[in-house]
């Protein structure tokens, strides 16, 4: 709950805020969780703590790890965790999914793309914007404060947008880039990171020994037919076909449905004649498309049959 994922690129600045909030007067101590070593506050260090902020100036791949922040007040202590991952710069232009911030949608009336995390930094204009790695040029694009405005949005404006700015710390400049996808709402189709509607994460499903049971994996991927999108089941991290238990079968083919205009896929897992050993297995509902993979885990528990006394 009080853990936050943060990421950045090597040799760029990264500033992380403690997920636990407190008054400015409260002191915040930062530690590297693996070693419980205190993070220094002296600004001469490459990695240092500055109140609620943890600063990597610049970041290195070796900085990856979990950092603990403790907000101390006269009456309580609050602990938060920052899970930091620093990636190597890609040699090609394509931005991998794990470096992408949340997708934003726009329409003809509202086409603001905010530069993610920029509020944490001491930056000065101009903010540079790139689409699919190419610098944006033309009067339709306006860099305004911390966001980009696109005039007369068209379907072809959908894409991956990167903002680039300079963070200044005590006279030293550090580069920062952040990328997010932009989709145009009124286009015929758009794609989302898969959203699993069922089962709920870590759901416990009650089954009766000796009876049949069905589990449905259902996920939505966006609007319109989705390219290379799929839902499937795994048993203990293995494909159903490779698991080798003939009683447990995945329905052939995926059923396509539409929910609130979104394209969704269902896959039913059928377990015949449920046995005790089935309760020990981990059942994973997987949904994937070109954006990435989402997984929800289900476990089975024995449903106690109601005793009927004559």
């Amino acid at each position: 709950k009080f853990s936050k994922q943060s990421w950045g690129l090597e040799n760029e600045a990264l500033i992380v805020r403690c997920p636990r909030q407190g008054k400015p007067s409260y002191t915040v101590d930062w530690y590297y969780s693996q070693t419980n070593k205190s993070i220094p506050t002296q600004e001469r260090n490459r990695v240092f703590a500055s109140g609620q902020l943890l600063k990597f100036l610049p970041a290195a791949v070796a900085d990856s790890g979990i950092y603990t922040c403790i907000v101390r007040s006269p009456t309580f202590n609050r602990t938060g965790y920052a899970n930091v991952t620093i990636y190597k710069k890609q040699s090609d232009c394509n931005v991998p999914d794990y470096l992408m911030y949340s997708t934003v949608s726009g329409s003809e009336k509202n086409s603001k793309i905010y530069c993610p995390t920029i509020d944490l930094y001491n930056w000065t204009a101009p903010l540079e914007w790139f689409k699919n790695c190419q610098a944006l040029q033309g009067s339709r694009y306006r860099a305004h404060k911390s966001f980009l405005v696109i005039d007369n949005v068209m379907t072809e404006d959908a894409g991956d947008y990167t903002c680039k700015f300079i963070h200044n710390e005590n006279g030293a400049n550090y580069s920062v880039t952040a990328t997010r996808s932009f989709t145009v709402k009124d286009e015929q189709g758009f794609s989302l990171f898969p959203v699993i509607g069922a089962p709920a994460q870590n759901e416990i499903k009650e089954v009766e020994i000796g009876k049949n049971a069905n589990l449905t994996c259902s996920a939505c991927f966006g609007k319109g037919t989705q390219f290379l999108a799929a839902v499937l089941w795994q048993l203990n991290g293995t494909k159903i076909t490779d698991f080798g238990e003939p009683r447990i079968q995945q329905e052939e083919g995926q059923n396509q449905s539409f929910s609130n205009g979104l394209a969704c896929l269902d896959m039913v897992l059928r377990i015949a004649d449920v046995k005790e050993e089935d309760l020990l297995l981990q059942y994973d509902c997987l949904a994937l498309n070109l954006h990435g993979l989402r997984r929800h885990t289900v476990r089975l528990s024995r449903k106690n049959p109601i005793d009927h006394h004559s």
Partner: antibody
Framework: EVQLLESGGGLVKPGGSLRLSCAAS????????MSWVRQAPGKGLEWVSA????????YYADSVKGRFTISRDDSKNTLYLQMNSLKTEDTAVYYC???????????????WGQGTMVTVSS | DIQMTQSPSSLSASVGDRVTITCRAS??????LNWYQQKPGKAPKLLIY???SLQTGVPSRFSGSGSGTDFTLTISSLQPEDFATYYC?????????FGQGTKVEIK
């Protein structure tokens, strides 16, 4: 430099088997869906198969389903295509290609190998 | 499966000409269309993705447009190195399908 290099093509008799390999370099191989596309002599391009970045899911063209198997070894940055029960109509140059996502949900084959020739003939 | 039809199948043009190739899908495919260039004995090369986005490193004389079922690839001023075969490909649904190709030859 981003590169894909196929190998394993050759002459095989109908009903025979062949395994194609595609060595990737210059990018984070495990992050990408990969595909095989073929081109019969003097003909157009035909998509054959695709595999997700986690090797969790695979897709096949109807013409090869049940005969071809796509796989990958992310530790070796290598994509494979196992071709069994080969037919004369499988004769083609086989290309491996990287799939790049676009934000509207589609994908393009943005990096291609140089291709390897597979000839099925008695 | 979605059928992709290109026209013309071949065309003759001179250096400096403006060349237009069209691609029609058998059903609406939004903007999920890509264009490739292939020279004899070489692998295809991505030119345009998502109907109108220019792939990095591709000259700006290439442009793409269209949405739904009708798409166009335009070469504003044909250069000697542009004589090749061009393919469209839809990525709206699986399986991805290609057009039959358009060969651009020297007049």
């Amino acid at each position: 430099e981003v590169q894909l290099l196929e190998s394993g093509g050759g002459l095989v008799k109908p009903g025979g088997s062949l395994r194609l390999s595609c060595a990737a370099s210059g990018f984070t191989f495990s992050s990408y869906w990969m595909s095989w596309v073929r081109q019969a002599p003097g003909k157009g391009l035909e998509w054959v198969s695709a595999i997700s970045g986690t090797a969790i899911n695979t897709y096949y063209a109807d013409s090869v389903k049940g005969r071809f198997t796509i796989s990958r070894d992310d530790s070796k940055n290598t994509l494979y295509l196992q071709m069994n029960s080969l037919k004369t109509e499988d004769t083609a140059v086989y290309y491996c290609a990287r799939v790049r996502r676009d934000s509207s949900g589609g994908g393009a084959f943005d990096i291609w190998g140089q291709g390897t020739m597979v000839t099925v003939s008695s | 499966d979605i059928q992709m039809t290109q026209s013309p199948s071949s065309l003759s043009a001179s250096v400096g000409d403006r060349v237009t190739i069209t691609c029609r899908a058998s059903q609406g495919i939004s903007n999920n269309l890509n264009w490739y260039q292939q020279k004899p004995g070489k692998a295809p090369k991505l030119l345009i993705y998502a109907a109108s986005s220019l792939q990095t490193g591709v000259p700006s004389r290439f442009s793409g447009s269209g949405s739904g079922t009708d798409f166009t690839l335009t070469i504003s001023s044909l250069q000697p190195e542009d004589f090749a075969t061009y393919y469209c490909q839809q990525s709206y649904s699986t399986p991805p399908t290609f057009g039959q190709g358009t060969k651009v030859e020297i007049k």
